[in-house]
Interface confidence: low
């Protein structure tokens, strides 16, 4: 710190006093000097460091009519809302000619009720799950001892005997309040009261019970929920593209999920109105009167394939002698899976039914046995997926080919000598 020289007497006729008070106090430090000639600018030091942004005012009063006469200079430093950072040794400093003069020191101290640097915060925790709360207070005067309270009941016999800055709670089964008291020689300050809301634990073991093409039955194990019974569980399902990238930690799915509520128990739910042969991701959360648990991680599931829901459309069957030409279009109804092909069955009035697998073609030419005199020949077609056959079309009678009708050339399919198996006729 700058030092005054001994060559000249100090100009200070009034030195800063002392201030001791509680946080938030407003006070003023003053120093006064008498100088000859032009009044100097007064600076303030705290602990030897110049206060560049000090809230100070300077008043100058001439003691004579001549500018070279003596002046009284008063500098006042205002401290608003006293904080710990304001404490220390204060001095005034002036430059007079080539000399530096420093006043005698004054002291600013802080003493009062404890002040909280950190208080317990409201939070939600899962039932029976450890967590910790923080509380930190300081004086002066030190020491500051803390006493934690749960639901207004002290957790130790006396301040300073229990947990101090951090309270470890091994788990709660009901929503509780926590606060801490800070004690020092001046008295007691009480922190805010934090409400710790006990939510159900995250459900576990989310799994599939059964699968249908348009519905999935899922079950899970509920977590503990403390003294609060679960009111319901909420299940979300979302279509999962290959690139959607739902991962365990990802907070939200990319599109609006399908949400269903399940009353509990049982901890089971049938999710309907799903697309067949489609991958989904599902998750579940359970709710008590205190609020919902966290979601489980997303679980990838898939609906199985179903059979086509309708028969092939626009079936036409024409006959020319010993050949029959049949063609059709894909079913308009949902296929519920990957179309693997078509089955065709034909039968005459007094002949056994013949069943054929046509594959994915939508037309076929049949080579009929005999002289073509089989009467009342009818044809039915069904589409199939890996899950099985869809419904058969209504029997379509074979119409005689009329000259002028185009007869496309098609690969001939020989009728098998005996049916592979019999199909119920309509």
């Amino acid at each position: 710190a700058p030092r005054g020289t001994q060559a000249e007497e100090s100009p200070f006729v009034g030195n800063p006093g002392n201030i001791t008070g509680a946080r938030g106090l407003t006070g003023t430090l003053r120093c006064q000097l008498q100088v000859q000639g032009e009044p100097p600018e007064v600076h303030w030091l705290r602990d030897g460091q110049i206060l560049e942004l000090a809230d100070s005012t300077q008043t100058q009063v001439p003691l004579g009519e001549d500018e070279q006469d003596d002046w009284i200079v008063v500098s006042q430093l205002r401290i608003t809302s006293l904080q710990l950072s304001d404490t220390g040794q204060y001095q005034c400093l002036v430059f007079l000619g080539h000399q530096t003069f420093v006043s005698q020191p004054g002291y600013v101290g802080l003493e009062g009720l404890p002040y909280f640097l950190e208080e317990p915060e409201d939070r939600t925790v899962a039932a029976n799950t450890p967590f910790n709360l923080s509380c930190q207070a300081q004086g002066p005067p030190e020491p500051v001892d803390l006493l934690w309270l749960q639901d207004a009941v002290p957790l130790a016999t006396a301040p300073g005997h229990g947990p101090q800055r951090s309270l470890h709670v091994p788990g709660l089964n009901k929503t509780s309040s926590f606060s801490c008291e800070a004690h020092n020689a001046k008295g007691v300050t009480t922190s805010r009261t934090a409400t710790i809301t006990v939510l159900p634990q995250q459900p576990r073991n989310l799994h599939l019970v059964s699968r249908q093409p348009t519905e999935l039955e899922v079950a899970w194990t509920p977590g503990l929920s403390g003294i609060y019974p679960l009111t319901h569980c909420t299940l979300q399902a979302v279509l999962s593209d290959d690139g959607m990238g739902i991962q365990a930690g990802e907070p939200d799915p990319p599109e609006e999920p399908l949400t269903s509520q399940a009353s509990v128990p049982p901890h089971q739910l049938r999710l309907g109105s799903l697309h067949p042969h489609t991958p989904y991701h599902i998750r579940v959360a359970c709710t008590s009167s205190q609020g919902p648990s966290s979601w489980t991680h997303w679980l990838p599931v898939e609906t199985p394939e179903g059979v086509p829901l309708g028969p092939p459309e626009n079936i036409s069957a024409t006959r020319n002698g010993s050949q029959a030409f049949v063609h059709w279009q894909e079913p308009r109804a949902p296929l519920q899976g990957t179309l693997l092909g078509y089955r065709l069955a034909y039968q005459g009035q007094d002949t056994p039914e013949v069943l054929m697998d046509i594959g994915l073609r939508q037309e076929v030419t049949l080579e009929l046995q005999g002289d073509g005199s089989v009467s009342n020949l009818t044809v039915c077609v069904a589409a199939y997926t890996a899950a099985g056959d869809g419904p058969w079309s209504l029997p379509v009678p074979l119409e005689a080919w009329r000259p002028g009708q185009a007869q496309p050339v098609h690969q001939l399919v020989k009728e098998p000598s005996t049916p592979a198996f019999s199909w119920p006729w309509w």
């Epitope: 450890p130 091994p170 788990g171 503990l224 930690g249």
Partner: antibody, heavy 117, light 107 residues
Framework: EVNLVESGGGLVQPGGSLKLSCATS????????MYWVRQTPEKRLEWVAY????????YYPDTVKGRFTISRDNAKNTLYLQMSRLKSEDTAMYYC??????????WGQGTSVTVSS | DIVMTQSHKFMSTSVGDRVSITCKAS??????VAWYQQKPGQSPKLLIY???TRHTGVPDRFTGSGSGTDYTLTISSVQAEDLALYYC?????????FGSGTKLEIK
Amino acid sequence: EVNLVESGGGLVQPGGSLKLSCATSGFTFSDYYMYWVRQTPEKRLEWVAYISNGGGSTYYPDTVKGRFTISRDNAKNTLYLQMSRLKSEDTAMYYCARLHFYAMDYWGQGTSVTVSS
Amino acid sequence: DIVMTQSHKFMSTSVGDRVSITCKASQDVSTAVAWYQQKPGQSPKLLIYWASTRHTGVPDRFTGSGSGTDYTLTISSVQAEDLALYYCQQHYNTPFTFGSGTKLEIK
């Protein structure tokens, strides 16, 4: 001074059983959740079980679920691990440890379990 | 299960050096990460919990940092007695899982 001392390890045949104990001192045992952790011969650490301070809640990983049972006697300040249907992959050094903000702040010196025919 | 990956099985350093041991979680573990030191022939000892809180009695040359999935244990000035295996552990979700360990060797 916090002290945890495991015992009960040894050589056992596959399918056999063993009961480990962990005697504790130097802290209020009934205030703390406790763990069993094992360290394989390859030095890999695996959490085996944990139990709440009152003993009402226990948790196990799938690797030991249904075969191992953690328990405690707060009057005796002792933690136990009953191991049954032991497999060769259960061969390890078994440590008991005290829970501190979900981390393990004090560990015992360990007891060795060898499952071999 | 959450997988904790310590990509360096071994790290070689000299006394006085600064060294950082890393650990990556397979998902966000919200700073619920602890670090342990295991010296030869001893049981593991807790160094850091909640990613950055130093356990009682641990020298201040050990610091922990990180968030989300990436965590680091830093020894600001390695001492000869720091020769040990260092493990990370997530205590975010059961089953609590450990990294496979990083062996710190002194040159």
